[in-house]
């Protein structure tokens, strides 16, 4: 299996909500002896490998933000802890999984990584990750809504319909 990142760059104004997305691709064994551990963390573009370093997202570690279930089962973090930090990770039946960040600030800018660990009984684990950049902007140059740039081409896409400003 592989992990695809539909968008490699998200450019958002301060105060906006955004959902970063990854997708599980390829043959996903739905047998009882296979489960998937999915999580999110911040990282840096290392010289050797992107996403090798695991940093917290808003002080929450990858341990706090994980999802665990079979291949295409739905799941989401119900932890109050994550929601108190304006975060929620979720997964659907189609292999998509995401993290939603509410009320973005400039401090949220950086590289985000999704990680999938395939746990197959009596086999070694198989780890795959995806990376995407989040740029939070303020001032007159900031977009009015989040703009996303597909991984395959740099054609931008406005995601106004899906993400709304955080109202105080």
């Amino acid at each position: 299996f592989k992990v695809a990142t539909p968008y490699s760059l998200y450019v958002c104004p301060e105060g906006q909500n955004v959902t970063l997305t990854c997708r599980l691709l390829g043959p996903v064994d739905k047998g009882h002896d296979v489960t998937f551990y999915k999580t999110w963390y911040r990282s840096s573009r290392g010289e050797v490998q992107t996403c090798s370093e695991r940093r917290p997202i808003r002080n929450l570690t990858f341990q706090d933000l994980h999802l665990h279930h079979g291949g295409h089962q739905a799941a989401n973090t119900s932890h109050d802890l994550a929601q108190r930090h304006g975060l929620e990770s979720a997964s659907d039946h189609h292999g998509n999984f995401s993290i939603t960040m509410r009320n973005l600030t400039l401090l949220d800018s950086g590289l985000y990584c999704c990680l999938v660990v395939e746990i197959r009984h009596h086999h070694s684990e198989h780890r795959v990750h995806g990376a995407m950049e989040l740029q939070v902007q303020t001032g007159k140059d900031a977009p009015s809504n989040c703009v996303v740039y597909p991984s395959s081409s740099q054609e931008s896409e406005n995601i106004t319909a899906h993400h709304h400003h955080h109202h105080h």
Partner: antibody, heavy 118, light 107 residues
């Protein structure tokens, strides 16, 4: 921060049994994949057994297979190691540790000493 | 099982000196290797994960490198609290295995 505390160690004769417990403080123990690791006096670390957050799969080191049984009770935030047919070479400090997928032993208890001697 | 061999068994150094510890795997473990520090009477503490990344709260004087079968842990300038036993551990395959340890002692 979650803490792990082992108990149940002690002196036991060869061939005897002992049940170790590992109590976790905090509300997320059911998310934890766990292992038991032991350390003989003055020696190195040896992984003993693993259990996933749901209780399956379970793995054992060859040295304890058929004699030790790992289990957990998520409602009680507890991990267990039932040790039967104990041998002198099982003498060690036994640690419980968190063992998340794609990760390492990042959270350890303080250990409990098991001494097998006649 | 994958055997991890650490060298040297003991390293005698003074505070301020550089320590270089080695861990060699009997077969490739990719970058799925960790380093732990253990002080007398204490449980081990995760220092390095995935061969080269410092765990949370670990000082910058600790660095590590390697992949495949050869790995190195370096302490750039030894502090008094760094004298301890260091273990490498792989999670590429079952069973999880540890090296036999390197003791860093005060000269």
């Amino acid at each position: 921060q979650v803490q792990l505390v082992e108990s149940g160690g002690g002196l036991v004769k060869p061939g005897g049994s002992l049940r170790l417990s590992c109590a976790a403080s905090g509300e997320t123990f059911s998310d934890y994949y766990m292992s038991w690791i032991r350390q003989a006096p003055g020696k190195g670390l040896e992984w003993v057994s693993y259990i996933s957050n749901s209780g399956s799969p379970i793995y054992y080191a060859d040295s304890v297979k058929g004699r030790f049984t790992i289990s957990r009770d998520n409602a009680k935030n507890s991990l267990y190691l039932q040790m039967n047919s104990l041998r002198a070479e099982d003498t060690a400090v036994y640690y419980c540790a968190r063992d998340l997928p794609g990760w390492y032993f990042d959270l350890w208890g303080r250990g409990t000493l098991v001494t097998v001697s006649s | 099982e994958i055997v991890l061999t650490q060298s040297p068994a003991t390293l005698s150094l003074s505070p301020g000196e550089r320590a270089t510890l080695s861990c060699r795997a009997s077969q490739s473990v990719s970058s799925y290797l960790a380093w732990y520090q253990q002080k007398p009477g204490q449980a081990p503490r995760l220092l390095i994960y995935d061969a080269s990344n410092r765990a949370t709260g670990i000082p910058a004087r600790f660095s590590a490198s390697g992949s495949g079968t050869d790995f190195t842990l370096t302490i750039s300038s030894l502090e008094p609290e760094d004298f301890a036993v260091y273990y490498c551990q792989q999670r590429n395959n079952w069973p999880r295995t540890f090296g036999q340890g390197t003791k860093v002692e005060i000269k």
